[in-house]
Amino acid sequence: HNTTVFQGVAGQSLQVSCPYDSMKHWGRRKAWCRQLGEKGPCQRVVSTHNLWLLSFLRRWNGSTAITDDTLGGTLTITLRNLQPHDAGLYQCQSLHGSEADTLRKVLVEVLADPLDHRDAGDLWFPGESESFEDAHVEHSISRSLLEGEIPFPPTS
């Protein structure tokens, strides 16, 4: 899988879209996970509704939401009140049993808010990820500010 880069601004919302073949993945729940290491686990952040027919309903875990357009074949993840530590390598997944197929690899880049004059040195910055081929950049920056919640903490 190639990796798609989505750029967001700290404090704002970022929408990530993962297109897929709706027929091939018919009846499958979807998930959004964070790659914790090069060969390490991809930790589940949030998944779609337990009932596939209700996948269109937005589900939240902390500041991350997921919704699935099962007919159109587009999984949408929203990261609200984006923080520097939200940066990283993620995967959109299609679930079947205990297995998961990767729909898309996503690199989230978090840029400092140009209108925020706080000292950038007080922010935290994230990192990078395994070698990706020809990453495509999508400037997917939403200006609508939502009330922030505590970012999802990784656990092993």
Partner: antibody, heavy 119, light 107 residues
């Protein structure tokens, strides 16, 4: 194989300037945040500066803010650290590091380049 | 800022020994901890990330555990190449701070 090769270190007088470079290979450089970490002689590790994969945002430790500038040239797979107004306490081995996805740990390190600030 | 304190500062052990190095955070850091190994004149190498995940190529004799404020790095059976200095590091949230290091020497 991931490789990071620093250069540009040396002896400089207090108040002087130096520019460090780090040539990266073995991975898609433009997809990674990068950072500089330093180690004073006989001391522990100290994070110095980082920047995002596009170079769109930069971050600095308080100890170097306003004096050091981190940058990158993704077309050349190279990371830089411009160091101005150098002080004796900046004397250290400077390591170029690659950072793993949003987690703040450094998975690959260069061999380091020594910067000595002395009159 | 959260401080990371390692103990002991130095440790003498023999090949084959089981060794434990501890790292204490001044506040709860969850499982957001990494460990590095550094040999004299060399760059540090990542050993463990997120408390317990071994990095690529790291031997299984190295293991990490803990959560909250107390963490340990264990070497189950010391090998000659393991004599080095070990650093813990708080990760994921700012600021990135390292412990002062634990020097593991041959007895």
């Amino acid at each position: 194989e991931v490789q990071l090769l620093e250069s540009g270190g040396g002896l400089v007088q207090p108040g002087g300037s130096l520019r460090l470079s780090c040539a990266a290979s073995g991975f898609t450089f433009s997809n990674y945040y990068m950072a500089w970490v330093r180690q004073a002689p006989g001391k522990g590790l100290e994070w110095v500066s980082s920047l995002t994969n596009s170079g769109g945002s930069t971050y600095y430790a308080d100890s170097v803010k306003g004096r050091f500038t981190i940058s990158r040239d993704n077309s050349k797979n190279t990371l830089y650290l411009q160091m101005n107004s150098l002080r004796a306490e900046d004397t250290a081995v400077y390591y170029c590091t690659r950072e793993w996805a949003g987690s703040g740990y450094f998975d690959y390190w260069g061999q380091g380049t020594l910067v000595t600030v002395s009159s | 800022d959260i401080q990371m304190t390692q103990s002991p500062s130095s440790l003498s052990a023999s090949v084959g020994d089981r060794v434990t190095i501890t790292c204490k955070a001044s506040q709860n850091v969850g499982n957001n901890l990494a460990w590095y190994q550094q040999k004299p004149g060399k760059a540090p190498k990542l050993l463990i990330y997120y408390t317990s995940n071994r990095f690529t190529g790291v031997p299984s004799r190295f293991s990490g555990s803990g959560s909250g404020t107390d963490f340990t790095l264990t070497i189950s059976s010391l090998q000659p190449e393991d004599f080095a200095t070990y650093y813990c590091q708080r990760i994921y949230n700012s600021p990135w701070t390292f412990g002062q290091g634990t020097k593991l020497e041959i007895k």
